[in-house]
Amino acid sequence: QPQGLSGMQGEPSLGDSSSGEDELGVDVLPSEEDAPEEADPPDGEDPPEVNSEDRMEESLGLEDLSTPEAPEHSQGSHGDEKGGGHSHWSYGGTLLWPQVSPACAGRFQSPVDIRLERTAFCRTLQPLELLGYELQPLPELSLSNNGHTVQLTLPPGLKMALGPGQEYRALQLHLHWGTSDHPGSEHTVNGHRFPAEIHVVHLSTAFSELHEALGRPGGLAVLAAFLQESPEENSAYEQLLSHLEEISEEGSKIEIPGLDVSALLPSDLSRYYRYEGSLTTPPCSQGVIWTVFNETVKLSAKQLHTLSVSLWGPRDSRLQLNFRATQPLNGRTIEASFPAAEDSSPEPVHVNSCFTAGD
């Protein structure tokens, strides 16, 4: 059995699950351990920017005390020389994001650090239901490099239910990653940053158009999973990664065969963390229901390397370290569908704190 975070003592053994995924086990993970933030920064305040050279050279495990931004040379800020005065934003200049979109200075932003001992076990959080995610090779899907990430646009028909009466349809999926020697997930667990993270973005069926849902509670829902290194190649991810060379240039878009989107997520859809946050890129609209799975998805070292070196972004720089710093919870509670807190009792705690999308 893969071991979870709860109640781990001493040296845990890393079990293999048939789907090639493991539970979140911080002590076991090959990527570097990032120290958790000591406390939430003051309201509406971004952590200080960290110089890229300082960040890459001083790998003392302390950098996530300020959850640093991606280095300036990775995603340099842009002027008007490209795109005719576009509202540019970059991972190297997240302190400027509120100027691009005021919502980025909101109180309930994403991503966040998931502190396991502070999660609230919520028994009403049922296993997620995915319908229609097993796509056939035809029709083909658009895979693009938009300069910030690699994006797979999903067709109509992928339906997901967070719970009774909370139905969504998938719009697209994208990834966040680091470099070969620095992890790049957006969410962290007890301060630990994983090599990479997948986001599947969904629109509530209560809204016919995206712009109507932005900023509305429960209007958007994102399924997130951490990518972790393992010896075996992940065949599902290979169907994406094998095409990255074709979209290496910013702005490239190709058509690839349809694939089983559910195979890109963990097999265990019953154990997850849930909170209300925001889009992690401008316009940083709030009201987004986040589901972060406890089980990680396993990719080979070669696959993670391919992800981190294949794409190019603005100003002929590598598209790397495309993650936002973790944001203060500002009083939010992260709920868990299982007893994740190490000292959790068999009975659910804070059971009345459970929220539903749209509350």
Partner: nanobody, 117 residues
Framework: QVQLQESGGGLVQPGGSLRLSCAAS???????????VAWYRQAPGKQRELVAV???????KYSDSVKGRFTISRDNAKNTILLQMNSLKPEDTAVYYC????????WGQGTQVTVSS
């Protein structure tokens, strides 16, 4: 509802110029500024192909067949995408579509460009 409306197409002689415009109407301001915007074209009997794009990160990319002749730009204040087409060739004849891509795709109805003497 977000709607994209192209204009500026027409009949032009080889070597001539046209300026296509695409206006986004509806409550799209909170999407448009953060989207990748693009022009595609579809010639009779052929697949739709990407002509030019401005990514959400601000970079521009052109298909090899239009490089140096076409220029894409955007005006976020007016929610408008422009395509300046110079030195037009008969093979540029197609229906041109504008596209806004932010979490989901938005498409215009298209405008016909015909290059013929």
């Amino acid at each position: 509802q977000v709607q994209l409306q192209e204009s500026g197409g027409g009949l032009v002689q080889p070597g001539g110029s046209l300026r296509l415009s695409c206006a986004a109407s509806g409550n799209s301001a909170n999407i448009f500024s953060f989207a990748s915007v693009a022009w595609y074209r579809q010639a009779p009997g052929k697949q739709r192909e990407l002509v030019a794009v401005i990514t959400s990160a601000g970079g521009t990319k052109y298909s090899d067949s239009v490089k140096g002749r076409f220029t894409i730009s955007r005006d976020n204040a007016k929610n408008t995408i422009l395509l300046q087409m110079n030195s037009l060739k008969p093979e540029d004849t197609a229906v041109y579509y504008c596209n806004v891509d932010y979490l989901q795709d938005y498409w215009g109805q298209g405008t016909q460009v015909t290059v013929s003497s």
